[in-house]
């Protein structure tokens, strides 16, 4: 969370950004809020990126002005125009690329004053893991798969019954490059598992942490997955 203050004569406004992460190939949002101003035509939003000449996006007088937009962002940006008057200057970024990572500045000018704040935008790939019972191995095994990760994550297994146990010797993890030659599919197999025990497959890189849980009993297979972006907030 970054809060910036701006001074315009005697006037300053608070601009707030949130460090966020973009999933390459998907759409992302760079979050920025400011003190609302009911005079839409008096609001100017400028998004800038460190090291890039020209603007990422500009919104003024109630509409986009892309005359100074850098070509790498052409056709890929939008603000939430209907939410600008309530103080939302967040930027929608289509088809996130690895090269979109960096430091961005959200600059705001309104009739109340002006202000800006920076945000760090990380890019990579992250996806929810799915754990299934694996029948290819000779022993009772579990297979944890996640289709898209970058940079290469670490993978670890844990179990509710054997807390603190090291499963590296009874698991096998592989990374398979996807067709676009950037992201990778993660596959990890855990051997010699038992029923009535909850096993967790944890996948983590510097952008995200994902966990898949599975519990096999006589009567059912219970699964749960969750994904958490790191250093966001």
């Amino acid at each position: 969370l970054i809060i910036g203050f701006g001074i315009s004569g005697k006037h300053f406004i608070t601009v707030t950004t949130f460090t966020s992460a973009g999933n390459i190939g998907e759409d992302g949002t760079l979050s920025c809020t400011f003190e609302p101003d009911i005079k839409l035509n008096g609001i100017v939003i400028q998004w800038l990126k460190e090291g890039i000449k020209g603007l990422v996006h500009e919104f003024k007088e109630g509409k986009d002005d892309l005359s100074q937009q850098h070509e790498m962002f052409r056709g890929r940006t939008a603000v939430f125009a209907d939410q600008v008057v309530v103080g939302n200057a967040s930027l929608r970024l289509k088809n996130v690329q690895l090269t979109d990572a960096g430091t961005y500045t959200c600059y705001i000018r309104t009739s109340k004053g002006k202000g800006n704040a920076n945000l760090e935008y990380k890019t990579g790939a992250f996806s929810m893991p799915e754990i299934n019972v694996d029948y290819n191995a000779s022993s009772e095994s579990l297979r944890c798969e996640a289709p898209r990760w970058f940079p290469q994550p670490t993978v670890a297994w844990a179990s509710q019954v054997d807390q603190g146990a090291n499963f590296s010797e009874v698991s096998n993890t592989s990374f398979e490059l996807n067709s676009e030659n950037v992201t990778m599919k993660v596959v990890s197999v855990l051997y010699n598992v038992t029923i009535n025990n909850t096993y967790s497959c944890m996948i983590e890189n510097d952008i995200a942490k994902a966990t898949g849980d599975i519990k096999v009993t006589d009567s059912e297979v219970k699964r749960r997955s969750q994904l958490q972006l790191l250093n966001s907030g």
Epitope: V133, Y135, E140, I195, V216, T217, D218, S219, E220, V221
Partner: nanobody, 122 residues
Amino acid sequence: EVQLVESGGGLVQPGGSLRLSCAASGFTFTDFWMHWVRQVPGKGREWVSRISPDGSSTSYEDSVKGRFTISRDNAKNTVYLQMHGLRAEDTAVYYCTRFSTGWHRIEYFQHWGQGTLVTVSS
């Protein structure tokens, strides 16, 4: 209450055939893998075969591969074991059981019927 009722056993000559049936009730049949297990009198139980809930995946113990075929009719809540080329060593009480997965460690199975006796003898 889970109920499994096996039938179809009997006395058959070596090389002969039998078709075992198992009628299931008291649970959602299509949620479960079904397994056949056999027990030679005086010995421990041995897993024979399994079939996935939709019937698309089957597996067999090595000694029965190519001779036994497992199938299921989900409309009738029934699983079958077609046995050809029967041998003396196939003599056993045959049980069907259910489990949430295709894992087939005997100690995992909690529900058993009365079994059906298959005797292979000339």
